[in-house]
Interface confidence: low
């Protein structure tokens, strides 16, 4: 590094590549003024600093336009790799998500991480939970010891990408029925249900038998 400086001091510093685009250049410090539209950037070599005039600023710096001269200024945003301005990041360090010009290790509420771009995008926005519904089972509010009560919430805004899942919009929990027995002395309709199911099954079996017989005779006639 030191040799480079010794060489450039012997040579005419104007021909030094560091002086490209300069309005003012010195052998010790390189550029100190840049041509219009170029950005002044202070580069380090060891503990020496020297100026360069660049068309665009290096990673970790942004182009700051000023009346006296445009310059490259350091991104001061935490965990930011490159930025557009003093307070707007465009690329975060590895492991951080970009959201509105800032870098986060976790996306804020209402936003979901998009792993392929490491950005926080608008997640699925849901409303508030409703009150818990009536405790019921098989659409009945009596006749059982335990039932289920449900609450729901609406999707207010769909996510920008289909790959982003919405949180659950309905949830149920076990609840104790207020009436173990239904009014009017009716027993639990379990036995009746069982009888009906048995009847139904027998009817289906009989119909299937008849259908098989019909197919067999039909084939014989052909």
């Amino acid at each position: 590094q030191g040799n480079r400086w010794r060489r450039s001091k012997r040579a005419s510093y104007v021909s030094n590549p560091i002086c490209k685009g300069c309005l003012s250049c010195s052998k010790d410090n390189g550029c100190s003024r840049c041509q219009q539209k170029l950005f002044f950037f202070l580069r380090r070599e060891g503990m020496r600093q020297y100026g360069e005039c660049l068309h665009s600023c290096p990673s970790g710096y942004y182009g700051h336009r000023a009346p006296d001269m445009n310059r490259c200024a350091r991104c001061r945003i935490e965990n930011c790799d490159s930025c557009f301005s003093k307070d707007f990041c465009t690329k975060c360090k590895v492991g951080f998500y970009l959201h509105r010009g800032r870098c986060f290790d976790e996306c804020p509420d209402g936003f979901a991480p998009l792993e392929e771009t490491m950005e926080c995008v608008e997640g699925c926005e849901v409303g508030h939970w409703s009150e818990w519904g009536t405790c019921s089972r098989n659409n009945r509010t009596c006749g059982f010891k335990w039932g289920l009560e449900t609450r729901t919430r609406q999707i207010v805004k769909k996510p920008v990408k289909d790959t982003i899942l919405c949180p659950t919009i309905a949830e149920s929990r076990r609840c104790k029925m207020t009436m173990r027995h239904c009014p009017g002395g009716k027993r639990t309709p379990k036995a009746k249900e069982k009888r009906n199911k048995k009847k139904k099954r027998k009817l289906i079996e009989r119909a299937q038998e008849q259908h098989s017989v019909f197919l067999a005779t039909d084939r014989a006639n052909q």
Epitope: S24, S32, M47, R48, Q49, D68, M69, R76, E78
Partner: antibody
């Protein structure tokens, strides 16, 4: 908001040792060069030591008056920079400031910690 | 000859303008320099970096402050002086392996 908080100052006898600490917040500490600058009572500013980042292998530089006695180090995982001061002299009595270094100048300063070397 | 030379004190009136000077030794005459401001019992504050004919200000440095240079001289100009401008102003420069400060100029408002 960039914040630098120094600690570890105090009264020490000549030829004694002291370790100053500086905790940084509000910026990506591992990206920044760090320095210690001191100011003797009623005097001007004096640069003391400087440490580069990991990219530059944590290279260190010292002013002639402290070389061989002081040692600067950093712990990026804890956002800390340290100044180990050995074989202290009365002329080391000063307020020691921890500073961030933008492009080899000191753009942010801590509140300082007082070091008094006296028998 | 010191690397950076500053006059010990300067006085000026409230609302007026003032120009502080930092003179570089011949071997450093092309260097950039920095200006720092320090109020009594406070930490120094970076104001700006001055190059040949241009400057880069630090965050929070008022527009009333500007920097310029002429040969080996570097200037800090303050217009419309305010009470809070009363402070010591240091210039500083980086060399190959060290950083040097000037002795400071005390700005007093009349």
């Amino acid at each position: 908001e960039v914040q630098l908080v120094e600690s570890g100052g105090g009264l020490v006898k000549p030829e004694g040792s002291l370790k100053l600490s500086c905790v940084a917040s509000g910026f990506t500490f591992s990206d920044y060069f760090m320095s210690w600058v001191r100011q003797a009572p009623g005097q001007g500013l004096e640069w003391v030591a400087h440490i580069y980042t990991k990219t530059y292998n944590y290279a260190t530089y010292y002013s002639g008056s402290v070389k061989g006695r002081f040692s600067i180090s950093r712990d990026d995982s804890r956002n800390m920079v340290y100044l180990q001061m050995n074989n202290l002299r009365t002329e080391d009595t000063a307020t020691y400031y921890c500073t961030t270094d933008e492009d080899w100048y000191f753009d942010f300063w801590g509140q300082g910690t007082q070091v008094t070397v006296s028998s | 000859q010191p690397v950076l030379t500053q006059s010990p004190s300067v006085s000026a009136s409230l609302g007026a303008s003032v120009k502080l000077t930092c003179t570089l030794s011949s071997q450093h005459s092309t260097n950039y320099i920095e200006w720092y401001q320090q109020h009594p019992d406070k930490s120094p504050k970076f104001l700006m970096q001055v190059r040949d004919g241009s400057h880069s200000k630090g965050d929070g440095t008022p527009d009333r402050f500007s920097g310029s240079s002429s040969g080996a001289h570097r200037y800090l100009s303050i217009s419309n002086l305010q009470l809070e401008d009363e402070a010591i102003y240091y210039c500083g420069l980086s060399d190959v392996s060290l950083y040097l400060f000037g002795s400071g100029t005390q700005l007093t408002l009349l």
